[in-house]
Every structure is written in C-alpha cells, then in structure tokens.
Amino acid sequence: PGPPAGSPRVSSDPRADLDSAVLLTRSLLADTRQLAAQMRDKFPADGDHNLDSLPTLAMSAGTLGSLQLPGVLTRLRVDLMSYFRHVQWLRRAAGPSLKTLEPELGALQARLERLLRRLQLLMSRLALPQAAPDQPAVPLGPPASAWGSIRAAHAILGGLHLTLDWAVRGLLLLKTRL
C-alpha cells in the first residue's frame, strides 16, 4: 500500500496567524487613535494622564532589533489582556459623560478580544510558553469622580495607542524571523 492519506490544510498556519495579528493590531491602532482624538475633542486633556494599574510600555525603538518571538508575544498578550480589563472596567465604571462613547468602547473591547485570541492561537501553533491569559488582575476601584473616569479614559487610550504602535513594529519584525 502507498503512504497514508494526508490531512487537508486547516484554515491558517503560523505565518498566516502572524499576518492576521498584524492586520488586527493595525486596525485596532487606528480605532484607538480615532477614539483618543474623540476623547480629546469632547474632554480636552490637561497634560498627560497616568494610571498606576496600567502596564509599563514594553519596548522602545532601541530594543526593537533584539526582539525574540516568545518574549514579544508573551509580553504583548499580557499587556493587551490588562488593557482589555481596563476597557471593560471603564465601560462599567464610566459616568454619564463617557456613556456617549459606549459603542466605540464596546467595539474596541471586541477587537481587543479578537486580537488576544489570534495571539493565543499563534502561540499554541508555535508551541511557545503561554502566559495564562486570565492572571489575577490588579483590582480596579470605581473612579473618584466623573472627571476621574475621564482622566482614566485618556490614560487607557494613550497607553493602548503606544502599546499597539510598538506591537505593529515588533510583529512586522518577527515576520522576517518565522
């Protein structure tokens, strides 16, 4: 008898997963940029806003060249999970002033979830160590005031924007190594 029948190809492979992650990240970056601009229009920011519970920016332009696939994907996934939780919290805790942005925040959360699942699939297919996606979160208390939730929104969107920006660059660089 000849060799056993092979398996048909599944819908994607690791390279296609990485391409898809790049596209999703770019699209999420555009959404975040647009939402951050809307926030600035509606609620002008008085300087930069920080939130202690947000992850610190993982990469700088100088470290891009030394990126390794496992480190980038693990860190990106952990950071995006944190932002996902912060967007969730913002939607729950937002006062009436932020309710006008609810559809955009909901769409942003859904896109973040899609990207997180794509990254998980990519890491599974590459058999890279998986950081648990649902690690215990930093407890987020309700904002002190309506202005507190607006400042938090500025901080979350600003941080997410920077994270996605390095993520696009990092993922594109990793494509050449896979």
Epitope: S7, P14, A132, P133, D134
Partner: antibody, heavy 114, light 112 residues
Amino acid sequence: EVQLLESGGGLVQPGGSLRLSCAASGFTFSSYGMHWVRQAPGKGLEWVSVISYDGSYKYYADSVKGRFTISRDNSKNTLYLQMNSLRAEDTAVYYCAAGVPDYWGQGTLVTVSS
Amino acid sequence: QSVLTQPPSASGTPGQRVTISCTGSSSNIGAGYDVHWYQQLPGTAPKLLIYSNNERPSGVPDRFSGSKSGTSASLAISGLRSEDEADYYCAAWDDSLNGPVFGGGTKLTVLG
C-alpha cells in the same frame, strides 16, 4: 496535502529503548510546534511531549519526564522521540502532531512486553 | 483520570442535534485558554474538528459548532448522520503541564 509519517515503533522489552521518527511534508515544518500524543489500546488520547517551532522549548507529561526526549531537525523536516526505560504502561499508538495540534500522523504502535 | 471531563457516551438518531460537554479547571479552560475538538473515526487518527472554541477548519461541515463559557465548553452536532459515529475529544492548553490536556473522550452512537 499535509503528511506526517511516523516510524520506529515495535516490540521492546521493559527497560528497553526505542527512537520514534516523524517525517513531515506538505507544510512549513519549521513554523510549527510539534507534539507526540499517545493512545493506549481502547483508551483515550494522552499528550506526551511538545517542542517549539525552533526547538528552544520542550515540555513533557509527568508520566514520561526523565525517560523520554523530544527533538527535531528542521533541515530534515523530522521530529524525534527518544524513549528510554520503557514500561508496560507505555504501550500505545504514538501519534506525531503539528500545531494546535492541527495535523496528525497515522501513528506507530509501541508494545512494551517481556 | 483525564484533566478535562467529558461524558463517556452520547447518542442520537439521524437528523437530531446532540451536544457533548467538556469541563475543565482554573489551570486550563478557566484560565482563558481556547478549546479545540477532535473527531476520531474507528481505526483512524484524530482529526481537528473545531479550533479556538468555535472556528471550523476548511472542509468541516457547518453542522459542527463549538462554544465556551467559564470553565466549560461544548460541541454541538446538528443534523446527525451515521458517518458522525466516532469518538470526540476536547483539548485545551494547561498551565500546570505547559502542554495541552485532553478530555477522556465521548463515544457518539448514531441510533437506527
């Protein structure tokens, strides 16, 4: 079409060794993590070991830790499983699988018996 | 004993809808990891049926669907056919293993 072809199975005495190979074709082998999964006669699937796409990460089920070694040669599109100190309970069909696992070979039977 | 729990058997008549459950723990499904489903026809190797909770590989009919909630997942097969008679396994990554864990398998019988 994706093909994974296992070889190296057979009858071995308890305490003996075997080396399984899995020849891959039809996909970019070096982009996939690879697994060994086994199935004892009439039983369910049991994950044995995994190796990352570039060979830098290797993990094992507790039941085989210290006895089995997984390795790969991306230049030859081949996955290996070195099995030492074999026991009767290692008797099973051993499947090589790629990715999630997305693709599976047809399996090779390993029988450990005196 | 398997880390993911499935009913050992399930059955249905042609045309019916059947569901197979898969229950995990906080180190696998409950930790947020995706669930994959495999079909193993008698005497053959397993085949990927559903990946990432609810995605179908090309060639898998849309009669097969998956879902996940909390620490559990389920596989639904609608419009049951005789050729669906097989063993079905769920799998998910597990933190304590650093690898995938499988359910014990569910033997699906198509009656009549």
